[in-house]
């Protein structure tokens, strides 16, 4: 139901305060009485929080997928919906909650945790994995002087990453979603672990580029795990660290 949709998208975390505009000093988002979100922007007011719009599953949190809120509803209006639990109906893996995948139209347990978690995050944060939904609605009903086939440049408004030119992705910046550069090796990235963590980000970063994934920056001098940055790193640098 739409109520559960609203609840699943209620208050979502903001991007980390490091690595650029993700956190502007001296600003805050007022999302609910008595709750202050540092790293947001004081000019934004969220009186009645709206479900987060999306065009691709990747734009939603790891416990969500992108679809129309109503069965057989307007394909042009898609939002992040709460994932389907085990034994619920599904049409694709992204619809199923972490630890499950879609098999024969039903969400079933994945013993290997193959379709979600670290492995899926590595895949979805890699360049070129653009699962654009066949949503059946054009970017504009009337295209002024802009040709339909034109791919967006940096700073162009977009609805989905497939609207953007190669090397760019569609990410939110304040009240619009715009084409931004895909992240390069060593650049700070945002790891979305919590449910629906894209929802209140007013400055979304792109995913990591080809051959890269978003991982904790290995820094042995860092005492606190929580303060560690995530950066785009080469896949082959993935080593298992055993704790003694």
């Amino acid at each position: 139901t739409l109520n559960s949709v609203l609840n699943s998208n209620a208050i979502k975390n903001l991007p980390p305060p490091l690595g650029g505009a993700a956190g502007h000093p001296g600003s805050a988002v007022s999302a609910a009485p008595g709750i202050l979100y540092p790293g947001g922007n004081k000019y934004q007011t969220i009186d009645n929080y709206q479900p987060y719009p999306c065009a691709e599953d990747e734009e939603c949190g790891t416990d969500e997928y992108c679809a129309s809120p109503t069965r057989g509803g307007d394909a042009g209006v898609q939002i992040c919906l709460a994932c389907r639990k085990r034994r619920k109906r599904c049409m694709r893996h992204a619809m199923c909650c972490p630890g499950n995948y879609c098999k024969n139209g039903i969400c079933v347990s994945s013993d290997q945790n193959h379709f979600r978690g670290e492995i899926e995050e590595t895949i979805t944060e890699s360049f070129g994995n653009d699962h654009s939904t066949l949503d059946g609605y054009s970017r504009r009903t009337t295209l002024s002087s802009k040709m339909y086939h034109t791919k967006g440049q940096e700073g162009s408004v977009c609805l989905r990453s497939s609207d953007c030119a190669s090397g760019l992705c569609c990410a939110r910046h304040f009240w619009s979603k715009i084409c931004k550069p895909v992240l390069k090796e060593g650049q700070v990235c945002t790891k979305h672990r919590r449910k629906g963590s894209h929802g209140l980000e007013i400055f979304q970063r792109c995913y990591c580029g080809e051959g890269l994934s978003c991982r904790i920056q290995k820094d042995h001098h860092q005492a606190s795990n929580s303060s560690r940055l995530h950066t785009c790193q080469r896949h082959h640098h993935h080593h298992h660290h055993h704790h003694h």
């Epitope: 934004q44 007011t45 719009p53 002024s144 940096e154 550069p181």
Partner: antibody, heavy 117, light 111 residues
Framework: EVQLVESGGGLVQPGGSLRLSCAAS????????ISWVRQAPGKGLEWVAS???????YYPDSVKGRFTISRDNAKNSLYLQMNSLRAEDTAVYYC???????????WGQGTTVTVSS | EIVLTQSPATLSLSPGERATLSCRAS??????????INWYQQKPGQAPRLLIY???KQGSGIPARFSGSGSGTDFTLTISSLEPEDFAVYYC?????????FGGGTKVEIK
């Protein structure tokens, strides 16, 4: 063709209220951000409010608490409810959309608001 | 908020001449690999018209004689050869942060 047509301007006394409308056509209204920008006589441009395609609203300190931006996607319309009007709110009010670029790339012709006793 | 300072306030030139307009920001308007600066043209009694977005990219239907350059805090709008219809007021705007702010404008007038 993208069109934005403002209406609702007029003369109002200080402390009064006014509601501006902007009728949009030629694009998928519900998907895009739309804003109000004003220009006082002989002055420069000043941003007044914005609303995203998903309904978040943004205001500068100068109008926060007095002005409310809203949209009716079913009617392809944008509104600006202006309360507690002051003389310094006198300006031409434009609605502007961000369709192709992260900028105000389409503008209406403007509607004039005069706050005077 | 980010303050944009445009110079000169007035530029007196003849048709065919090159116009160079400056916009300086109080802090960098670059982020995510993008310069969040836009340029608009406004003629008397008309709404503004977008010329350049993201620092250097041309808006739809904008003649090639208009170009934008710069990064960080210093930006330039160049009109390579002024046409009679180019005499107007030009504004820069930043959209890196809310509130979006505009410069005070540069009036390009006929010499």
């Amino acid at each position: 063709e993208v069109q934005l047509v403002e209406s609702g301007g007029g003369l109002v006394q200080p402390g009064g209220s006014l509601r501006l409308s902007c009728a949009a056509s030629g694009f998928t209204f519900s998907s895009y951000a739309i804003s109000w920008v004003r220009q006082a006589p002989g002055k420069g441009l000043e941003w007044v409010a914005s609303v995203s395609g998903w309904g978040d609203t943004y205001y500068p300190d100068s109008v926060k608490g007095r002005f409310t931006i809203s949209r009716d996607n079913a009617k392809n319309s944008l509104y600006l409810q202006m309360n507690s009007l002051r003389a310094e709110d006198t300006a031409v009010y434009y609605c502007a959309s961000s369709l192709d670029n992260y900028a105000f790339d389409y503008w209406g012709q403007g509607t004039t608001v005069t706050v005077s006793s | 908020e980010i303050v944009l300072t445009q110079s000169p306030a007035t530029l007196s030139l003849s048709p065919g001449e090159r116009a160079t307009l400056s916009c300086r920001a109080s802090e960098s308007v670059d982020d995510f690999g993008i310069s969040f600066i836009n340029w608009y043209q406004q003629k008397p009694g008309q709404a503004p018209r977008l010329l350049i977005y993201a620092g250097s990219k041309q808006g739809s239907g904008i003649p090639a004689r208009f170009s934008g350059s710069g990064s960080g805090t210093d930006f330039t709008l160049t009109i390579s050869s002024l046409e009679p219809e180019d005499f107007a007021v030009y504004y820069c705007q930043q959209l890196k942060e809310v509130p979006p702010t505009f410069g005070g404008g540069t009036k390009v007038e006929i010499k």
